[in-house]
Amino acid sequence: AFGISGVQKYTRALHDSSITGISPITEYLASLSTYNDQSITFALEDESYEIYVEDLKKDEKKDKVLLSYYESQHPSNESGDGVDGKMLMVTLSPTKDFWLHANNKEHSVELHKCEKPLPDQAFFVLHNMHSNCVSFECKTDPGVFIGVKDNHLALIKVDSSENLCTENILFKLSET
């Protein structure tokens, strides 16, 4: 998991990190839910979209996101997040050609259609947290995480190490 003592040091390292190549080391389809087991769902049209955080009906299938895992070149000083001491970054795609993006100016999580290579705003550092949860830290704005605010996804600034385990930035990945 993300080390409690290393917030500032890790933040500096993130600024300098770059992604090895343009191909993911692995890809994984998973449903995304909050710490409180609400589902993340996507209502996407060509010109508009909504990202919901909601309780799903019992008979409804959960939306899935395609998580593409990338290895960053910068070695991680923290344990648990990387492969061979390197950080793992992910992109998240709910459907073909669309990816979650961090809009740091608006503190929002957006869906954008784009071609590869993807912009840095589409990359998130993956942190394995407690209770089989993960969190997603913006590559472009270290210390800022995808979180839940008012039943929507938003970018949330985590300014102290104690807040790294706050429930609103914790997510669960499931194959079902």
């Epitope: 049209e45 060509d46 009906k57 019992k58 899935k64 795609s93 459907t95 050609d97």
Partner: antibody, heavy 126, light 106 residues
């Protein structure tokens, strides 16, 4: 603007065949599941068939299974319904409909029908 | 096969409230959609995911769904609301429509 334009309807004898087409425009055709829905004279709406955005998955109502084939040509932005062994009870206005939202990776039929064509009449009679 | 049951007809005076029910086994465990169809026209989606209204659909249209019944409510019904209304759910990768309800504005 989303537009769906059906064609190919007409009068056909029982046991005959017909191919319906639905020309789509105004959206990324290959990203959406598409369906055929019909309404027989004096009756209600009946879902007939659906196809995934890639064309890799197809779904049919029991009433048409084995007789109708749904397909799509994403390069032409066109949806098709090949109807064989037609019966009198297949007489209806046939609508093509687009899912409200783009397909998610999980696939399957999940979303409401957000956009409809104007329909094409199929009459099966001797 | 899954069956959705609607009343064949509902009559309402202008300005009054019309309620159309749609019954099915464990209906509340599924998302219900509602479509309006006027004579000679194509169906139009008026409610999806039980309660949500597509853009362009007036606020007088609302929906609910729990138990075994979904309900479409038209508040302050107007003459232009006279039409056939259909509920619909997805079940086992098929679309299932109710039989339809003809709403007459007296």
């Amino acid at each position: 603007e989303v537009q769906l334009l059906e064609s190919g309807g007409g009068l056909v004898q029982p046991g005959g065949s017909l191919r319906l087409s639905c020309a789509a425009s105004g959206f990324t055709f290959s990203s959406y599941a598409m369906s055929w829905v019909r309404r027989a004279p004096g009756k209600g709406l009946e879902w007939v068939s659906a196809i995934s955005g890639s064309g890799g998955s197809t779904y049919y109502a029991d009433s048409v299974k084995g007789r109708f084939t749904i397909s799509r040509d994403n390069s032409k932005n066109t949806l098709y319904l090949q109807m064989n062994s037609l019966r009198a009870e297949d007489t209806a206005v046939y609508y093509c409909a687009r899912d409200l939202w783009m397909e998610n990776w999980v696939g399957g039929l999940r979303y409401p029908f957000g956009y409809w064509g104007q329909g094409t009449m199929v009459t099966v009679s001797s | 096969s899954y069956v959705l049951t609607q009343p064949p007809s509902v009559s309402v005076s202008p300005g009054q409230t019309a309620s159309i029910t749609c019954s099915g086994e464990r209906m509340g465990d599924k998302y219900a959609a509602w479509y309006q169809q006027k004579p000679g026209q194509s169906p139009v989606l008026v409610i999806y995911q039980d309660t949500k209204r597509p853009s362009g659909i007036p606020e007088r249209f609302s929906g609910s769904n729990s138990g075994n019944t979904a309900t479409l409510t038209i508040s302050g019904t107007q003459a232009i609301d006279e039409a056939d209304y259909y509920c619909e759910v997805k079940k086992s990768d098929t679309g299932v429509f109710g039989g339809g309800t003809k709403v007459t504005v007296l």
